[in-house]
């Protein structure tokens, strides 16, 4: 299991910027416009535009409320007028440089509209949002805008019993079959488009990936066994001519594996996914947050998957098929029979075009019938290194974003920012042989779940934005200035931070104006380069004979042990003479002359099998009659 975060920052301890509007709740949709330096926030019955550099500065707002009549009709259907029968913004996607596509639950009558960014007013198009946005604010949803067309995963009906993955398009709308083998009570988590690589095979298609958890069809279990899935569709899909007419011909899904090898620890509930794209990366990497199905201990894991691994399952993997045994009992088994050509579920690529299949509408019925009956792959998608990047105890992770950053020595590190159901943000760096949890920051005053996380990693301006029920918080990617000494700065093992001997401060890397010459950073936590030992100040105390002295020592690191020394000998709490407050401050009872002298508080921290010791406080005590 990953260690505890090295540092814990309380809500008021660090520079966080907040945005919230009284009476407005459920800030669950965030969209960044990097070029405009604007963050768009979708909440219950409202959309806001705020300054991305300081989100407390509101630029625009627009309200989208439900009429009393609609509320009453919704309440008649057994829903709560005060909560459910409102308009929860669930889709907030860019449509053009001047408009956003916005959908809301609208009192169980999902509706979409265009938001003009110049006037910041809705155009009043009021399109039916069914299949694009859930009816119920409690139901899962995901969406991504691709070339002006909305791809979404949600439930299609009032009861929430009909799941759908669809493309909303004027010329070629597509949807999944309403059939259990295609989608079985899914909980949608994430969707994104992966553009064909410029140096990839000619005529390759863009693909849209959907991530969700659903009830297993392939494993018989005493309880509903949940399975995390990745599904993909092709952007160029136009449906079939007769079979799969207006349905996906390229819909395939596979199981995502996230488990600890040689242990019974299986993480099968997908919480969130982030696609890491970075200049130094050959291909995108999917980072996914999981929890186990029976999670009474609060376990969470992060697994990462390469695009190539995912693609290989869909393009070369075996299929599963539903077999009927004893008249009507269903068993899912590997399909070992002949696979039609073109390969079922494959995108129309140059090879297909060469065989005269220029569109999915030309595909032979055999291929279409096969993919209709075999949407599930037998092969599973395995994580990088066949193991989780991180397993954390006593925490329920909710969302993840990942930044790839360059350390002072030129090495690239993936830094994960993972939010919790109690309003905290964990920051963890992936090192060669371990994951180091740098810090934990309490983003929200109340311990409320983080609903959404967004990363803005524009050079010289990097922030994480978190949305919750009560508001949005903006946090910098690092709090370097909080590390008061060179040792602290290096021991943080934060790739964003380095010690500047010139100004005797821990500074943030990649600030455009900064020159990093002479800066000290060591991702192994080696503090030997920290030569400028800060001049040792001390606190002088005078105490009365027979009294009790409390000597303070402030130690931030959760990984360090506080050691008190007197006359160069270590003080133990076992002795009736001494006691510790919060494992940090020293109490000396029944003071006598022999207690006069120099007391040193040191922190001892194990880093890579080495103990790093640093002086935290020095107290000179004098006992008087």
């Amino acid at each position: 299991f990953a260690p505890v975060p090295r540092l814990t920052w309380e809500h008021g301890e660090v520079g966080l910027v907040q945005f919230h509007k009284p009476g407005i709740f459920n800030y669950s949709a965030l969209l960044m416009s990097e070029d405009k330096d604007t963050l768009y926030v979708g909440a219950r019955e409202a959309v806001f535009a705020v300054n991305a550099l300081n989100i407390s500065e509101k630029q625009h707002e627009v309200y989208w409320k439900v009429s009393e009549d609609k509320k009453s009709k919704c309440a008649e259907k057994g829903k709560s007028k005060q909560t459910e029968c409102l308009n929860y913004i669930r889709v907030l996607q860019p449509l053009s440089s001047t408009s956003l596509y916005v959908c809301g639950t609208n009192a169980f009558q999902p509706t979409c509209d265009h938001l003009n960014l110049t006037s910041f007013k809705f155009l009043g198009k009021s399109e039916d949002g069914k299949g694009r946005c859930p009816f119920d604010p409690a139901h899962s949803y995901t969406s991504v805008m691709v070339g002006g067309e909305l791809y979404s995963g949600t439930s299609y009906n009032f009861l929430g019993s009909e799941p759908i993955i669809s493309r909303n398009s004027s010329h070629s709308p597509l949807r999944t079959e309403y059939a259990i083998p295609w989608l079985n009570e899914p909980s949608f988590v994430f969707a994104d488009v992966i553009q064909k690589s410029p140096d990839g095979p000619e005529g390759e298609d863009d693909k849209v990936y959907f991530f969700f958890t659903e009830v297993s069809v392939e494993y018989e279990f005493v309880f509903k066994l949940m399975i995390p899935r990745v599904a993909r569709v092709c952007k160029g899909d136009q449906g079939g001519l007769r079979t799969l007419q207006k349905k996906w011909t390229s819909f395939l899904k596979a199981r995502l594996i996230c488990s600890k090898p040689d242990s019974g620890l299986v993480f099968n509930i997908l919480q969130d996914v982030f696609v890491l794209r970075a200049p130094g990366l050959k291909e995108p990497v999917f980072y996914a947050v999981f929890t186990p199905q029976l999670n009474n201990v609060g376990l969470s894991a992060v697994c990462a998957y390469t695009l190539a691994t995912v693609e290989a399952v869909f393009s070369r993997g075996k299929y599963m098929q539903s077999a009927t045994v004893e008249q009507s009992h269903t068993k899912w088994v590997r399909y070992n029979g002949p696979v039609p050509t073109p390969r079922p579920g494959a995108c129309i690529d140059s090879e297909a075009r060469a065989a005269n299949y220029t569109s999915s509408l030309n595909l032979p019925d055999k291929t279409l019938q096969f993919v209709k009956d075999h949407p599930l792959m037998d092969d599973s998608v395995t994580p990088i290194d066949n193991r989780p990047k991180l397993i954390k105890k006593d925490v329920n992770y909710t969302q993840i974003v990942v930044d790839r950053t360059q350390a002072l020595d030129g090495t690239f590190y993936d830094v994960m920012f993972i939010s919790t159901d109690r309003g905290a943000l964990h920051k963890a760096v992936i090192l060669t042989k371990e994951v180091h949890v740098i810090e934990e920051t309490q983003l929200f005053r109340d311990s409320e779940p983080v609903l959404t996380l967004l990363l803005s990693s524009k050079k010289g301006r990097k922030f994480v934005y978190a949305g919750s029920n009560s508001g949005v918080v903006q946090a910098p990617l690092a709090f370097c200035e909080k590390h008061g000494s060179c040792e602290d700065c290096v021991l943080a093992r934060d790739p964003y931070c380095a010690w500047s001997p010139a100004i005797k401060a821990c500074v943030t890397l990649h600030q455009e104006e900064a020159s990093s010459r002479g800066w000290i950073q060591d991702m192994s936590g080696d503090t030997s380069s920290c030569l400028d030992k800060s001049k040792e100040s001390f606190n002088q105390h005078f105490f009365k004979h027979g009294g009790t002295a409390e000597l303070k020592c402030f130690q931030k690191s959760n990984l360090a042990r506080v050691v008190w020394k007197f006359q160069n000998g270590e003080l133990k709490a076992a002795s009736p003479k001494y006691g510790f407050v919060g494992r940090k401050h020293l109490l000396i009872f029944n003071l006598s002359d022999g207690d006069s002298g120099v007391y040193q508080c040191l922190s001892e921290e194990r880093v890579r099998n080495k103990t790093v010791s640093q002086l935290l406080a020095k107290h000179v005590l004098e006992v008087k009659m």
Partner: antibody
């Protein structure tokens, strides 16, 4: 061939309960949703609710919430509908029907007549 | 709920003649260009039988004298040449929005 066979007719007293069964054969039971539809004497058809056989997840027409409970037994490929607190207006023929890919009821059970009389 | 209204309530047509039954929905039953409208035939003492799905698709095994048309809110079931075995009650049904609703039925008889 694909078949849905329902249990026989029932005569029940007001206030009692009845459980109607629907046994599927000839297809993969877990691959299709099962729905229940009722037809009161001389009346039209009314959709009551549905169940996902793999999960046991049921959803109901608001009108029948609290009246009908739909369940499945995967091991016997059988769907059930229990009607509680029976009243004379619950007298009807109850049908189970398979919901096919194209969003229609393609196979129906023969129907079970439930008569509520004191 | 979507209300389905069939017309006429009953219809008498001569053998070999065309029979037309209409169904009007209180709101559109279309989604992305598909019409989720189905037609069923029910004979006395029997369960309903699917004839047409998605407004115009003929269920396999159903004679091609049956056809369906329409979109949005207005739909039609046509029997091009009435046969004696077509005497029954015909129901339209929408599956675009729950609760799924049926028309009140049209009784077709021979004149």
């Amino acid at each position: 061939q694909v078949q849905l066979v329902q249990s026989g007719a029932e005569v029940k007293k007001p206030g009692s309960s009845v459980k109607v069964s629907c046994k599927a054969s000839g297809y993969s039971f877990s691959d299709y949703y099962m729905h229940w539809v009722r037809q009161a004497p001389g009346q039209g058809l009314e959709w009551m609710g549905q169940i996902n056989p793999t999960t046991g997840g049921a959803s109901y027409n608001q009108k029948f919430k609290g009246k009908a409970t739909i369940t499945v037994d995967k091991s016997t490929s059988t769907a059930y509908m229990e009607l509680s607190s029976l009243r004379s207006e619950d007298t009807a023929v109850y049908y189970c029907a398979r919901y096919y890919y194209g969003r229609h009821f393609d196979v129906w059970g023969q129907g079970t007549t439930v008569t509520v009389s004191s | 709920d979507i209300v389905m209204t069939q017309s006429p309530d009953s219809l008498a047509v001569s053998l070999g003649e065309r029979a037309t039954i209409n169904c009007k929905a209180s709101q559109s039953v279309d989604y992305d260009g598909d019409s989720y409208m189905n037609w069923y035939q029910q004979k006395p003492g029997q369960p309903p039988k699917l004839l047409i799905y998605a407004a115009s698709n003929l269920e396999s095994g159903v004679p091609d004298r049956f056809s369906g048309s329409g979109s949005g809110t207005d739909f039609t079931l046509t029997i091009s040449s009435l046969q004696a075995e077509d005497v029954a009650v015909y129901y339209c049904q929408q599956s675009n929005e729950d609760p799924y609703t049926f028309g009140q039925g049209t009784k077709l008889e021979i004149k």
